[in-house]
Protein backbone atom coordinates (compact mmCIF):
# COMPACT_ATOMS: atom_id res chain seq x y z
CA UNK A 1 0.00 0.00 0.00
CA UNK A 2 1.26 3.52 -0.77
CA UNK A 3 0.28 6.42 1.03
CA UNK A 4 0.96 9.90 0.43
CA UNK A 5 -0.64 13.40 0.61
CA UNK A 6 -2.61 14.66 -2.79
CA UNK A 7 0.17 16.57 -4.83
CA UNK A 8 -2.91 18.04 -6.55
CA UNK A 9 -5.67 20.86 -5.17
CA UNK A 10 -7.99 18.14 -4.15
CA UNK A 11 -10.90 19.98 -2.73
CA UNK A 12 -12.95 22.67 -4.54
CA UNK A 13 -15.55 24.50 -3.55
CA UNK A 14 -18.99 25.81 -4.79
CA UNK A 15 -22.30 26.53 -3.92
CA UNK A 16 -22.16 25.43 -0.38
CA UNK A 17 -20.38 21.73 -1.04
CA UNK A 18 -17.01 20.54 -1.83
CA UNK A 19 -16.21 18.52 -4.58
CA UNK A 20 -13.46 15.85 -3.50
CA UNK A 21 -10.97 15.06 -6.59
CA UNK A 22 -9.80 11.29 -6.24
CA UNK A 23 -7.25 11.24 -9.77
CA UNK A 24 -5.48 8.07 -10.63
CA UNK A 25 -2.93 6.95 -13.50
CA UNK A 26 -4.99 6.66 -17.04
CA UNK A 27 -3.68 3.93 -17.64
CA UNK A 28 -5.42 2.17 -15.02
CA UNK A 29 -8.57 0.50 -16.84
CA UNK A 30 -10.36 -1.68 -13.57
CA UNK A 31 -10.33 -0.01 -9.68
CA UNK A 32 -12.14 0.65 -6.87
CA UNK A 33 -12.33 4.29 -5.68
CA UNK A 34 -13.43 4.81 -2.09
CA UNK A 35 -13.78 8.13 -0.34
CA UNK A 36 -12.94 7.69 3.40
CA UNK A 37 -13.50 10.73 5.94
CA UNK A 38 -10.76 9.65 8.83
CA UNK A 39 -11.41 5.74 8.80
CA UNK A 40 -15.00 5.84 7.74
CA UNK A 41 -16.06 5.11 4.14
CA UNK A 42 -18.30 7.77 2.89
CA UNK A 43 -18.52 6.78 -1.00
CA UNK A 44 -17.28 4.39 -3.05
CA UNK A 45 -16.78 3.59 -7.23
CA UNK A 46 -16.36 0.72 -8.98
CA UNK A 47 -15.04 0.27 -12.50
CA UNK A 48 -15.10 -2.97 -14.15
CA UNK A 49 -14.74 -4.57 -18.04
CA UNK A 50 -16.71 -6.66 -19.70
CA UNK A 51 -15.59 -8.89 -22.14
CA UNK A 52 -16.80 -6.63 -25.24
CA UNK A 53 -14.85 -3.83 -23.24
CA UNK A 54 -18.26 -2.74 -22.23
CA UNK A 55 -18.23 -1.09 -18.80
CA UNK A 56 -19.39 -1.36 -15.38
CA UNK A 57 -19.62 1.27 -13.04
CA UNK A 58 -21.43 0.22 -8.85
CA UNK A 59 -21.11 1.81 -6.33
CA UNK A 60 -22.10 0.30 -2.57
CA UNK A 61 -21.83 3.27 -1.10
CA UNK A 62 -23.40 5.47 -3.25
CA UNK A 63 -22.57 9.51 -3.46
CA UNK A 64 -22.94 12.04 -6.18
CA UNK A 65 -20.01 11.12 -7.99
CA UNK A 66 -18.63 12.06 -11.52
CA UNK A 67 -15.91 9.72 -13.23
CA UNK A 68 -13.04 10.77 -15.82
CA UNK A 69 -10.63 8.86 -17.86
CA UNK A 70 -8.39 9.78 -14.75
CA UNK A 71 -10.42 10.91 -11.66
CA UNK A 72 -13.29 10.27 -9.76
CA UNK A 73 -14.88 13.67 -8.33
CA UNK A 74 -17.40 12.91 -5.06
CA UNK A 75 -19.32 15.50 -3.91
CA UNK A 76 -20.82 16.51 -0.62
CA UNK A 77 -23.36 19.21 0.09
CA UNK A 78 -25.13 21.28 2.41
CA UNK A 79 -21.28 21.49 4.09
CA UNK A 80 -20.61 22.75 7.86
CA UNK A 81 -18.33 22.96 10.62
CA UNK A 82 -18.53 18.96 11.11
CA UNK A 83 -16.66 18.38 7.50
CA UNK A 84 -13.92 19.49 8.58
CA UNK A 85 -11.58 16.39 8.95
CA UNK A 86 -8.78 14.09 7.25
CA UNK A 87 -9.84 12.78 3.43
CA UNK A 88 -8.53 9.74 2.05
CA UNK A 89 -9.01 8.96 -1.54
CA UNK A 90 -8.50 4.80 -1.14
CA UNK A 91 -7.25 3.35 -5.04
CA UNK A 92 -7.44 -0.37 -5.58
CA UNK A 93 -6.11 -1.13 -8.70
CA UNK A 94 -7.26 -4.53 -10.73
CA UNK A 95 -6.04 -3.81 -14.21
CA UNK A 96 -3.44 -3.92 -14.87
CA UNK A 97 -2.16 -6.30 -12.37
CA UNK A 98 -0.77 -6.62 -10.15
CA UNK A 99 -3.22 -5.81 -7.67
CA UNK A 100 -1.98 -2.65 -5.81
CA UNK A 101 -3.52 -0.07 -2.99
CA UNK A 102 -2.89 3.65 -3.00
CA UNK A 103 -4.02 5.47 -0.09
CA UNK A 104 -3.69 9.80 -0.86
CA UNK A 105 -5.50 12.40 0.94
CA UNK A 106 -5.80 16.07 2.96
CA UNK A 107 -7.47 17.96 5.29
CA UNK A 108 -10.55 19.51 4.53
CA UNK A 109 -10.75 22.73 6.22
CA UNK A 110 -14.18 24.61 6.58
CA UNK A 111 -14.18 28.15 6.52
CA UNK A 112 -17.43 30.22 7.19
CA UNK A 113 -17.03 31.89 3.23
CA UNK A 114 -17.46 28.41 2.48
CA UNK A 115 -20.82 27.26 4.04
CA UNK A 116 -23.88 26.78 2.18
CA UNK A 117 -26.36 28.76 5.01
CA UNK A 118 -24.46 31.32 6.79
CA UNK A 119 -26.43 33.25 9.92
CA UNK A 120 -26.34 36.74 9.59
CA UNK B 1 -11.42 -27.52 -4.26
CA UNK B 2 -12.32 -25.56 -7.86
CA UNK B 3 -13.81 -27.93 -9.78
CA UNK B 4 -15.53 -27.47 -13.98
CA UNK B 5 -17.15 -30.95 -15.18
CA UNK B 6 -18.19 -31.16 -18.63
CA UNK B 7 -21.26 -33.28 -19.79
CA UNK B 8 -23.15 -34.03 -22.69
CA UNK B 9 -20.92 -34.93 -25.39
CA UNK B 10 -21.57 -37.46 -27.75
CA UNK B 11 -21.69 -38.76 -31.32
CA UNK B 12 -24.00 -36.39 -33.54
CA UNK B 13 -25.12 -36.76 -37.42
CA UNK B 14 -23.57 -33.36 -39.39
CA UNK B 15 -26.85 -30.58 -38.95
CA UNK B 16 -27.96 -32.29 -35.25
CA UNK B 17 -27.86 -30.64 -32.15
CA UNK B 18 -26.24 -30.99 -29.09
CA UNK B 19 -26.61 -28.95 -25.38
CA UNK B 20 -23.22 -29.19 -23.37
CA UNK B 21 -23.29 -28.59 -19.95
CA UNK B 22 -20.59 -27.37 -17.55
CA UNK B 23 -21.34 -27.65 -13.38
CA UNK B 24 -19.07 -25.22 -11.44
CA UNK B 25 -18.15 -25.97 -7.50
CA UNK B 26 -15.54 -24.09 -5.15
CA UNK B 27 -15.62 -20.83 -6.12
CA UNK B 28 -18.21 -17.83 -6.95
CA UNK B 29 -19.86 -18.74 -10.45
CA UNK B 30 -21.74 -15.74 -10.67
CA UNK B 31 -18.36 -13.40 -10.46
CA UNK B 32 -16.75 -14.89 -13.43
CA UNK B 33 -16.88 -14.72 -16.89
CA UNK B 34 -17.29 -18.10 -18.66
CA UNK B 35 -16.08 -19.35 -21.82
CA UNK B 36 -15.99 -22.24 -23.88
CA UNK B 37 -12.61 -23.63 -25.34
CA UNK B 38 -12.58 -26.38 -28.19
CA UNK B 39 -9.58 -28.46 -29.30
CA UNK B 40 -10.15 -30.67 -32.68
CA UNK B 41 -8.15 -34.24 -32.38
CA UNK B 42 -3.93 -33.61 -32.41
CA UNK B 43 -5.10 -29.50 -32.89
CA UNK B 44 -4.33 -26.19 -31.23
CA UNK B 45 -6.79 -24.66 -28.63
CA UNK B 46 -9.91 -22.43 -30.38
CA UNK B 47 -11.77 -20.07 -28.65
CA UNK B 48 -15.35 -20.41 -29.42
CA UNK B 49 -17.46 -17.60 -27.11
CA UNK B 50 -18.22 -16.38 -23.75
CA UNK B 51 -21.15 -15.03 -21.25
CA UNK B 52 -20.44 -12.30 -19.08
CA UNK B 53 -21.44 -11.68 -15.19
CA UNK B 54 -24.61 -10.32 -14.57
CA UNK B 55 -23.00 -7.04 -13.86
CA UNK B 56 -22.84 -6.91 -17.70
CA UNK B 57 -26.70 -8.13 -18.65
CA UNK B 58 -24.82 -12.12 -19.44
CA UNK B 59 -24.03 -10.81 -22.55
CA UNK B 60 -22.32 -13.34 -25.00
CA UNK B 61 -19.73 -12.84 -27.39
CA UNK B 62 -18.60 -15.74 -30.30
CA UNK B 63 -15.95 -16.15 -32.32
CA UNK B 64 -16.86 -16.07 -35.95
CA UNK B 65 -16.66 -19.97 -36.72
CA UNK B 66 -19.63 -20.57 -34.76
CA UNK B 67 -21.72 -17.00 -34.74
CA UNK B 68 -25.24 -18.15 -35.24
CA UNK B 69 -25.06 -21.43 -34.97
CA UNK B 70 -24.10 -21.89 -31.17
CA UNK B 71 -25.19 -20.24 -27.87
CA UNK B 72 -23.80 -19.80 -24.30
CA UNK B 73 -26.20 -19.25 -21.57
CA UNK B 74 -25.71 -19.72 -17.64
CA UNK B 75 -27.52 -20.50 -14.53
CA UNK B 76 -25.89 -18.70 -11.52
CA UNK B 77 -28.77 -20.30 -9.48
CA UNK B 78 -27.41 -23.63 -9.90
CA UNK B 79 -23.61 -22.84 -11.09
CA UNK B 80 -24.07 -23.95 -14.38
CA UNK B 81 -22.63 -23.49 -17.54
CA UNK B 82 -24.11 -24.14 -21.42
CA UNK B 83 -23.43 -24.55 -24.47
CA UNK B 84 -26.54 -25.13 -27.02
CA UNK B 85 -24.90 -26.09 -30.47
CA UNK B 86 -27.38 -26.14 -33.82
CA UNK B 87 -26.56 -27.52 -37.53
CA UNK B 88 -23.61 -29.22 -36.20
CA UNK B 89 -20.51 -29.70 -39.06
CA UNK B 90 -18.38 -32.19 -39.37
CA UNK B 91 -15.42 -29.49 -38.41
CA UNK B 92 -17.03 -29.12 -34.65
CA UNK B 93 -15.45 -32.41 -33.32
CA UNK B 94 -13.27 -31.26 -30.84
CA UNK B 95 -13.17 -31.73 -26.75
CA UNK B 96 -14.97 -28.92 -25.49
CA UNK B 97 -13.29 -26.98 -22.06
CA UNK B 98 -15.49 -24.78 -20.00
CA UNK B 99 -13.11 -21.99 -18.56
CA UNK B 100 -13.98 -19.39 -15.56
CA UNK B 101 -11.85 -16.31 -15.43
CA UNK B 102 -12.09 -13.22 -13.67
CA UNK B 103 -9.32 -10.37 -13.39
CA UNK B 104 -10.94 -8.52 -10.30
CA UNK B 105 -9.47 -8.27 -7.82
CA UNK B 106 -7.03 -11.14 -8.99
CA UNK B 107 -6.62 -12.78 -11.65
CA UNK B 108 -7.92 -16.36 -11.86
CA UNK B 109 -8.22 -18.80 -14.39
CA UNK B 110 -10.09 -22.43 -14.01
CA UNK B 111 -10.47 -24.87 -16.69
CA UNK B 112 -12.94 -28.20 -16.71
CA UNK B 113 -11.29 -31.71 -17.87
CA UNK B 114 -13.19 -31.32 -21.82
CA UNK B 115 -16.03 -33.46 -23.36
CA UNK B 116 -15.69 -35.17 -26.84
CA UNK B 117 -18.09 -34.13 -29.23
CA UNK B 118 -17.86 -36.28 -32.54
CA UNK B 119 -19.70 -34.86 -35.62
CA UNK B 120 -19.97 -37.86 -37.94
CA UNK B 121 -22.43 -39.30 -40.39
CA UNK C 1 -10.56 -10.04 -35.18
CA UNK C 2 -6.79 -10.16 -33.40
CA UNK C 3 -4.77 -13.47 -35.12
CA UNK C 4 -1.58 -14.83 -33.39
CA UNK C 5 1.34 -16.27 -34.41
CA UNK C 6 3.61 -18.36 -32.96
CA UNK C 7 7.35 -19.79 -33.38
CA UNK C 8 8.93 -21.86 -33.89
CA UNK C 9 5.99 -24.46 -34.35
CA UNK C 10 8.37 -27.36 -32.25
CA UNK C 11 11.20 -27.49 -30.82
CA UNK C 12 13.90 -29.75 -28.91
CA UNK C 13 15.99 -29.36 -26.31
CA UNK C 14 17.85 -30.98 -23.60
CA UNK C 15 17.54 -30.51 -20.30
CA UNK C 16 18.98 -27.54 -18.83
CA UNK C 17 18.74 -25.67 -21.81
CA UNK C 18 17.15 -22.19 -22.05
CA UNK C 19 14.30 -22.14 -23.99
CA UNK C 20 12.27 -19.33 -26.15
CA UNK C 21 9.27 -19.37 -28.26
CA UNK C 22 7.52 -15.92 -29.78
CA UNK C 23 4.25 -14.85 -30.24
CA UNK C 24 3.30 -12.40 -32.69
CA UNK C 25 -0.32 -10.27 -32.50
CA UNK C 26 -1.78 -9.07 -35.43
CA UNK C 27 -2.42 -5.80 -33.85
CA UNK C 28 -1.50 -4.09 -30.16
CA UNK C 29 -2.68 -5.48 -27.32
CA UNK C 30 -0.81 -3.82 -24.54
CA UNK C 31 0.44 -6.50 -22.59
CA UNK C 32 -3.06 -8.73 -22.33
CA UNK C 33 -1.21 -11.57 -23.24
CA UNK C 34 -1.05 -14.80 -21.08
CA UNK C 35 0.75 -18.24 -21.44
CA UNK C 36 -0.96 -21.86 -21.27
CA UNK C 37 0.94 -25.10 -20.88
CA UNK C 38 -1.02 -28.21 -21.84
CA UNK C 39 0.19 -31.84 -21.36
CA UNK C 40 -1.42 -34.61 -23.79
CA UNK C 41 -4.38 -35.56 -22.86
CA UNK C 42 -5.04 -32.80 -19.97
CA UNK C 43 -6.83 -29.37 -19.67
CA UNK C 44 -4.65 -26.32 -20.62
CA UNK C 45 -2.92 -24.90 -17.15
CA UNK C 46 -2.35 -21.01 -16.69
CA UNK C 47 1.35 -20.04 -16.46
CA UNK C 48 1.61 -16.21 -16.87
CA UNK C 49 -0.74 -13.63 -17.44
CA UNK C 50 -0.55 -10.22 -18.08
CA UNK C 51 2.63 -10.72 -20.26
CA UNK C 52 5.10 -11.26 -17.07
CA UNK C 53 3.24 -12.16 -13.95
CA UNK C 54 3.43 -15.97 -13.05
CA UNK C 55 0.22 -17.68 -12.25
CA UNK C 56 -0.32 -19.24 -8.63
CA UNK C 57 2.39 -22.21 -8.05
CA UNK C 58 4.03 -21.70 -11.11
CA UNK C 59 7.39 -22.15 -10.78
CA UNK C 60 10.35 -19.25 -11.58
CA UNK C 61 11.88 -20.91 -14.45
CA UNK C 62 9.07 -19.98 -16.52
CA UNK C 63 8.79 -15.59 -17.66
CA UNK C 64 7.53 -13.56 -20.04
CA UNK C 65 8.28 -10.26 -21.76
CA UNK C 66 7.00 -8.20 -24.58
CA UNK C 67 4.51 -5.33 -25.20
CA UNK C 68 2.07 -4.47 -27.49
CA UNK C 69 2.63 -6.69 -30.49
CA UNK C 70 5.51 -8.48 -29.76
CA UNK C 71 5.79 -11.23 -27.07
CA UNK C 72 8.47 -13.93 -25.54
CA UNK C 73 8.18 -17.11 -23.17
CA UNK C 74 10.95 -18.40 -21.69
CA UNK C 75 12.02 -21.16 -19.71
CA UNK C 76 15.28 -20.79 -17.86
CA UNK C 77 15.91 -24.31 -17.58
CA UNK C 78 14.37 -27.09 -19.10
CA UNK C 79 13.13 -29.67 -17.01
CA UNK C 80 11.62 -33.34 -18.24
CA UNK C 81 7.97 -32.35 -16.80
CA UNK C 82 8.10 -29.00 -18.93
CA UNK C 83 7.18 -31.25 -21.54
CA UNK C 84 4.30 -29.69 -23.66
CA UNK C 85 2.89 -28.02 -25.93
CA UNK C 86 2.70 -24.26 -25.16
CA UNK C 87 0.20 -21.70 -26.50
CA UNK C 88 0.16 -17.82 -26.06
CA UNK C 89 -3.26 -16.40 -25.90
CA UNK C 90 -4.82 -12.78 -25.77
CA UNK C 91 -7.34 -11.22 -24.19
CA UNK C 92 -7.28 -7.38 -25.16
CA UNK C 93 -10.52 -8.16 -27.25
CA UNK C 94 -12.04 -11.80 -26.40
CA UNK C 95 -9.70 -14.19 -26.31
CA UNK C 96 -7.52 -15.71 -29.44
CA UNK C 97 -4.94 -18.70 -28.69
CA UNK C 98 -2.26 -19.06 -31.17
CA UNK C 99 -1.28 -22.48 -32.71
CA UNK C 100 1.10 -23.58 -30.06
CA UNK C 101 4.02 -25.01 -29.39
CA UNK C 102 5.29 -28.23 -29.03
CA UNK C 103 8.56 -29.10 -26.59
CA UNK C 104 10.04 -32.17 -26.29
CA UNK C 105 13.58 -33.88 -24.54
CA UNK C 106 16.26 -34.16 -27.52
Known amino acids: EINGSANYEMFIFHNGGVQILCKYPDIVQQFKMQLLKGGQILCDLTKTKGSGNTVSIKSLKFCHSQLSNNSVSFFLYNLDHSHANYYFCNLSIFDPPPFKVTLTGGYLHIYESQLCCQLK | EVQLVESGGGLVKPGGSLRLSCAAS????????MHWVRQAPGKGLEWVGVIDTKSFNYATYYSDLVKGRFTISRDDSKNTLYLQMNSLKTEDTAVYYC????????????WGQGTLVTVSS | DIQMTQSPSSLSASVGDRVTITCQAS??????LSWYQQKPGKAPKLLIYYTNLLAEGVPSRFSGSGSGTDFTFTISSLQPEDIATYYCQQYYNYRTFGPGTKVDIK
Open chain 2, 26 to 33: GFTFSDYF
Open chain 3, 27 to 32: QDISNY
Open chain 2, 99 to 110: TATIAVPYYFDY
